[in-house]
């Protein structure tokens, strides 16, 4: 049993340069920005702006790029190695409980409460009771954690420990 390969384990000629259309799989896997051919012999580049892959993989197809919905703005475009990043338009936010849609931020706090946090693309305004200081809305969701355990960084396929 052994850990899975990282990009550094690959011989330089096996590392797919961004401009390459095809390269050879390493131990049956293709690097981010590529997918494997049906016969398993080649790594084929994803199509910029159409599809992508963020991890080492043996996908037969790259993943389709997300299209931002109306009510969203495109923060960064889809590349061959990264999906589109969409963000709610100003004055709206995306709740953890309903990540599929942007909701309008409240315009003000209920009576007896004071605003301590502004509307952001990921949270509604935050209100606290004037006297006690206890919150009325939920906590602002934490920024997504960049865990280095599986499934690894885009540059290297981490392992499930065997």
């Amino acid at each position: 049993e052994s850990a899975l390969i990282t990009q550094q384990d690959l011989a330089p000629q096996q590392r797919a340069a961004p401009q390459q259309k095809r390269s050879s799989p390493s131990e049956g896997l293709c690097p981010p920005g590529h997918h494997i051919s049906e016969d398993g012999r080649d790594c084929i580049s994803c199509k910029y702006g159409q599809d992508y892959s963020t991890h080492w993989n043996d996908l037969l197809f790259c993943l389709r790029c997300t299209r931002c919905d109306s009510g969203e703005v495109e923060l960064s475009p889809c590349t061959t190695t990264r999906n589109t990043v969409c963000q709610c338009e100003e004055g709206t936010f995306r709740e953890e409980d309903s990540p599929e849609m942007c909701r309008k931020c409240r315009t003000g706090c209920p009576r007896g409460m004071v605003k301590v946090g502004d509307c952001t693309p990921w949270s509604d305004i935050e209100c606290v009771h004037k006297e006690s200081g206890t919150k009325h809305s939920g906590e602002v969701p934490a920024v997504e954690e960049t865990v280095t355990s599986s499934p690894g960084t885009p540059a290297s396929p981490c392992s499930l420990s065997g």
Epitope: P25, G28, V85, S150, P151, P157, L160
Partner: antibody
Framework: EVQLVESGGGLVQPGGSLRLSCAAS????????MSWVRQAPGKGLEWVAA????????HYPDTVKGRFTISRDNAKNSLYLQMNSLRAEDTAVYYC??????????????WGQGTLVTVSS | DIVLTQSPDSLAVSLGERATINCRAS??????????MHWYQQKPGQPPKLLIY???NLESGVPDRFSGSGSRTDFTLTISSLQAEDVAVYYC?????????FGGGTKVEIK
Amino acid sequence: EVQLVESGGGLVQPGGSLRLSCAASGLPFNSYYMSWVRQAPGKGLEWVAAINSNGGRIHYPDTVKGRFTISRDNAKNSLYLQMNSLRAEDTAVYYCTRLTYYGNPAWFAYWGQGTLVTVSS
Amino acid sequence: DIVLTQSPDSLAVSLGERATINCRASESVDIYGNSFMHWYQQKPGQPPKLLIYLSSNLESGVPDRFSGSGSRTDFTLTISSLQAEDVAVYYCQQSYEDPLTFGGGTKVEIK
């Protein structure tokens, strides 16, 4: 069309051994991760073992580690599961699967029909 | 281990109506914009079949009445218009962390 055909199941006594085989066709077998998943009668699914394309990287959950061994013969397009020190709780249908890799062994794209292993005295 | 809790355990829906199955993970299964959650269908006497991978990607050949959504810890499989052939048990599965784990399953029946 991808076909995965399991064999080798049967009745075995507790503490005994059994070797399951899976014959694959319709895919470039030597390019893909393969795996075994089991399902106890009337119960849910449990992943049992995974192996990469050349057999050099192997993964098990703690429930079977040290007792089960996954292996493959790419020349024969075959996957194997050697099961030792079998227990009553290993009784299940064992499925051979083609495991898609995406940053990790990820999802089970194709499944065989399964072979039943019964551990009982 | 990441524990996946499916709800409800069983669900009876009229033909043509919407069926919604939930799967909650004991911790986030998101990283780098991907949700490492997948869905399977298992009809009586058959092996499971992949429906959805990475939360929302429809497997080739799967009818588009099936859809997946969700992120971090909360995921949903939706059948927009239930057909007789959709009677089955549905399982979620995560691949964020070792070991790969499945939810306990949700049985979908016709009302």
